[in-house]
Interface confidence: low
């Protein structure tokens, strides 16, 4: 979870962050879309067992216990049906909590774009967040860092990616000289553009920040009608939802 | 030279169906999406839809949703346009338009067919 | 959906002149916004997009300006190839929509 270029927030300012856990070490960050639902990206789920998976809520530095921190246990996981590990596309899944969220100062929601929202323009400012390395060298962060970046050019992006991008995908820049971006482990982190959760961060290059492989998100417009089908079949009582992966040793 | 060509148009009656083409040469056709847009008779724009051919994802104007439907056959480099259930309001010349991305904007719709001329009439 | 106004719906103007036209979204649509030109029979041709952005092969009198609500399109000496019908569209959100269209006619 690599935020390069990057500053620390002023804790808890960004409420919807999600710390993805497993065996006890940080994941992959998500967002909160509902009291029981978080967003995040596939891959961060392949080859997992969910029963060692933990959502943490309302932290800002994972590695103390903070009263504001809300941790629970995942019910369920609904990867997009399109998903494809070796390109990414499709990077998408739905988190359901084994309980609901309390809604506080901590702890809050995050939109996704409208139903019929085009993604983000070229040029536009945004901030991606994550909880991992602030350098190539693993060096841990204070707390949740964030970086602001712009929207880059699809057609500039694909090339740079030598035409492997799907048009569901979403790239950033710096904006300028510096270094500036995610990598791979701030995986389904959102990118946070107008004050909703346009894109979720799916890959980037080897090295942090590197303008030739510009950093690549999950368009999550492109995704808002799969999102809320899956939130709306959800029933209200314990249980898999249609199409969903419960925790291996768990009955159905 | 990117060319957009598109046929299909002509006189039907209320209730009737219709399918227009667009057969796109020049680019890569799957890398970008494709519009309709149509023009009534002295009259402006109006989107109608668009498909990114590459996945095949549409999407409509409200006025259309649920009787026309914008399809591709990537092998052909053509979209269609299906119009069903047909009314003397869709009378309009139709254009496709190839939908390019651009810097700080999406949709632009940098080439146009020549346009077909649909007539709804008894 | 986004309405796009244009103003004036049509002008008369000279070769040479220097033309304004303004299109108002309601509401905030960035830069997302392109200029088209007509003329009868034809199709619509790109000019100007993001709102600034001269189009390949569009002669630099051509210009655009504006974002948020408030853009504009200026021919800076109208030649007699400019009188036709334009258009502006808004690629913000879907569906993308079109002013009414400016109609230059000549003096």
């Known amino acids: 979870a690599q935020i390069i270029g990057g500053h620390e927030v002023t804790p808890h300012s960004r409420p919807y962050m999600a710390s993805v856990r497993f065996g006890g070490q940080h994941h992959c960050g998500g967002f909160l879309l509902r009291a029981r639902w978080v967003v995040s990206a596939a891959h961060c789920f392949s080859h997992r067992d969910l029963r060692t998976g933990l959502v943490v809520l309302g932290a800002h530095v994972l590695s103390t216990a903070e009263p504001t921190q809300q941790v629970f246990g995942i019910d369920a996981l609904t990867t997009h049906p399109d998903y494809h590990p070796m390109t990414h596309a499709n990077d998408i899944c739905l988190l359901r909590l084994n309980g609901s969220a309390v809604l506080g100062p901590a702890v809050g929601l995050l939109r996704p774009p409208g139903r019929r929202a085009r993604p983000p323009t070229a040029g536009t400012r945004c901030r991606v967040a994550g909880w991992g390395f602030v350098s190539d060298f693993e060096e841990l962060p204070p707390g949740l860092m964030e970086a602001k970046v712009r929207v880059l050019d699809p057609d500039v992006c694909n090339s740079s990616w030598k035409g492997h991008l799907t048009l569901t995908m979403l790239c950033t820049r710096s904006g300028d000289s510096h270094r500036r971006g995610f990598c791979s482990a701030d995986s389904g982190g959102p990118l946070v553009c107008r004050n909703r959760a346009h894109g979720l961060v799916s890959f980037s290059g080897l090295w942090c920040g590197d303008p030739k492989t510009p950093d690549v998100y999950t368009q999550v417009s492109a995704f808002v009608a799969w999102i809320w089908d899956v939130v709306r079949r959800s029933s209200p009582q314990p249980g898999p939802l249609p199409g969903t992966t419960r925790p291996p040793g768990e009955a159905a | 030279e990117v060319q957009l060509v598109e046929s299909g148009g002509g006189l039907v009656q209320p209730g009737g169906s219709l399918r227009l083409s667009c057969a796109a040469s020049?680019?890569?056709?799957?890398?970008?999406?494709i519009s309709w847009v149509r023009q009534a008779p002295g009259k402006g724009l109006e989107w109608v839809g668009e498909i990114y051919p590459s996945d095949g994802y549409t999407d409509y104007a409200d006025s259309v949703k649920g009787r026309f439907t914008i399809s591709a056959d990537t092998s052909k480099n053509t979209a269609y346009l299906q119009m069903n259930s047909l009314r003397a309001e869709d009378t309009a010349v139709y254009y496709c338009?190839?939908?390019?991305?651009?810097?700080?904007?999406?949709?632009?719709?940098?080439?146009w067919g020549q346009g077909t001329l649909v007539t709804v009439s008894s | 959906d986004i309405q796009m106004t244009q103003s004036p719906s049509s002008l008369s103007a000279s070769v040479g002149d220097r033309v304004t036209i303004t299109c108002r979204a309601s509401q905030d649509v960035s830069t997302a916004v392109a200029w088209y030109q007509q003329k009868p029979g034809k199709a619509p041709k790109l000019l100007i997009y993001?709102?600034?952005f001269l189009y390949s092969g569009v002669p630099s009198r051509f210009s655009g300006s504006g974002s948020g609500t408030d853009f504009t399109l200026t021919i800076s000496s109208l030649q007699p190839e400019d009188f036709a019908t334009y258009y502006c569209q808004q690629s913000y959100t879907t569906p993308p929509t079109f002013g009414q269209g400016t109609k230059v006619e000549i003096k």
């Open positions: 993001s709102a600034s």
């Open positions: 338009a190839r939908v390019k991305w651009a810097v700080s904007s999406l949709g632009v719709m940098d080439y």
């Open positions: 020049g680019f890569t056709f799957s890398s970008t999406a």
